[in-house]
């Protein structure tokens, strides 16, 4: 029985140019995490993987960073970056749980960041 | 569509060298991790090696660990084993295997395989 | 040494159901995961031709295997079934596991499944 929930930053926003932080956290379940995947529709951004660590896809690599922890971080934000991310958890034994963030990108200085998230 | 074409395969003396190569096509090569499996004549599946999306982590079975070496190039879609210092015992037909996206689940795609033949 | 034992034939009648077991065993008590044999993998090979996937994380079918085959798990075995057996079935059937700690894949011996 799946029992866990995943908690994540909900919905940011931020400025062109920018960087953002895209956190989730699984709770309420004693499932071992085997792997992480980071997806942006459904395209691949990265894998952080409890054996092999992390990878950022190809097309990604020069604006993706691993971390903090199993967040992945954006750098140089464009507008074509707004839209929905997902962090996809592989799980034994309970499967896959999948949360989602939508990210906004604005043209102006005055976007307004969600509320800051930490891993407890 | 995906496809993995093995090569390199042949007729060689105990002691030499072969190395064999798997293009891959019809998928992001990059995000994969491979797997390089064999079957002797008559016999089971046996695992040969395993390599990371970047090259940078690699496994061997005890069977051929010192002898054989997994690599990949990413710009050429190109997977690779080069085999020194062969045995008869080597003797069988050598697959290169695409691994599900968490490569913990299994293999998904494998190539049609190249013949090793180890004889004096 | 990491072990997969599946029984080396297996037989059945068109129409029938058939069940092929996968057993675990390991040597290496200092293996980092608890259950080591927890993602098991199942590949069909017919006569003469590479192995194809059949199931996945030890249950999941890929798209386009019939659902005539299914995958399950209980404690240091896993299970094939195939349901509604099929001329076209007989072939070598491998389970596979990655073992964490030996950072290794194993596979079983293979069972020959005939169909009478």
């Known amino acids: 029985m799946m029992t866990g929930t995943i908690e994540t930053t909900g919905n940011i926003s931020a400025e062109k140019g920018g960087s953002i932080i895209l956190q989730c956290h699984l709770s309420s379940t004693t499932a071992q995490v085997t792997q992480v995947n980071w997806e942006q529709q459904d395209q691949l951004l990265a894998i952080c993987n409890a054996d092999l660590g992390w990878h950022i896809s190809p097309s990604f690599k020069d604006r993706v960073a691993p971390g903090p922890g199993l967040g992945l971080t954006l750098q140089s934000l464009t507008v074509n970056d707004t839209g929905e991310y997902f962090c996809i958890y592989h799980t034994y034994p309970d499967g896959t749980y999948t949360g989602r963030i939508f990210l906004e990108v604005l043209e102006s200085s005055v976007a307004e960041h969600g509320a800051r998230f930490q891993i407890p | 569509e995906v496809q993995l074409l093995e090569s390199g395969g042949g007729l060689v003396q105990p002691g030499g060298s072969l190395r064999l190569s798997c293009a891959a096509s019809g998928f992001t090569f990059d995000d994969y991790v491979m797997s390089w499996v064999r079957q002797a004549p008559g016999k089971g599946l046996e695992w040969v090696s395993l390599i990371n999306w970047s090259g940078g982590t690699t496994y061997y079975a005890d069977s051929v660990k010192g002898r054989f070496t997994i690599s990949r190039d990413n710009s050429k879609n190109t997977l690779y084993l080069q085999m020194n210092s062969l045995r008869a015992e080597d003797t069988a037909v050598y697959y290169c295997?695409?691994?599900?996206?968490?490569?913990?689940?299994?293999?998904?795609?494998w190539g049609q395989g190249t013949t090793v033949t180890v004889s004096s | 040494q990491s072990v997969l034992t599946q029984p080396s034939s297996a037989s059945g009648t068109p129409g029938q159901r058939v069940t092929i077991s996968c057993s675990g065993t390991?040597?290496?008590?200092?293996?980092?995961?608890v259950s080591w044999y927890k993602y098991v993998s199942w590949y069909q090979q017919l006569p003469g031709t590479a192995p194809k996937l059949l199931i996945y994380n030890n249950v999941q079918r890929p798209s386009g295997v019939p659902d005539r085959f299914s995958g399950s798990q209980s404690g240091t075995s896993a299970s094939l079934a195939i349901s509604g057996l099929q001329s076209e079935d007989e072939a070598h059937y491998y389970c596979?596991?990655?073992?964490?700690?030996?950072?290794?894949?194993?596979f079983g011996g293979g069972t020959k499944l005939t169909v009478l």
């Open positions: 295997a695409k691994h599900w996206i968490v490569y913990q689940y299994g293999m998904d795609v």
């Open positions: 596979a596991s990655w073992e964490g700690g030996l950072n290794s894949w194993v």
């Open positions: 390991i040597s290496n008590i200092e293996t980092k995961y």
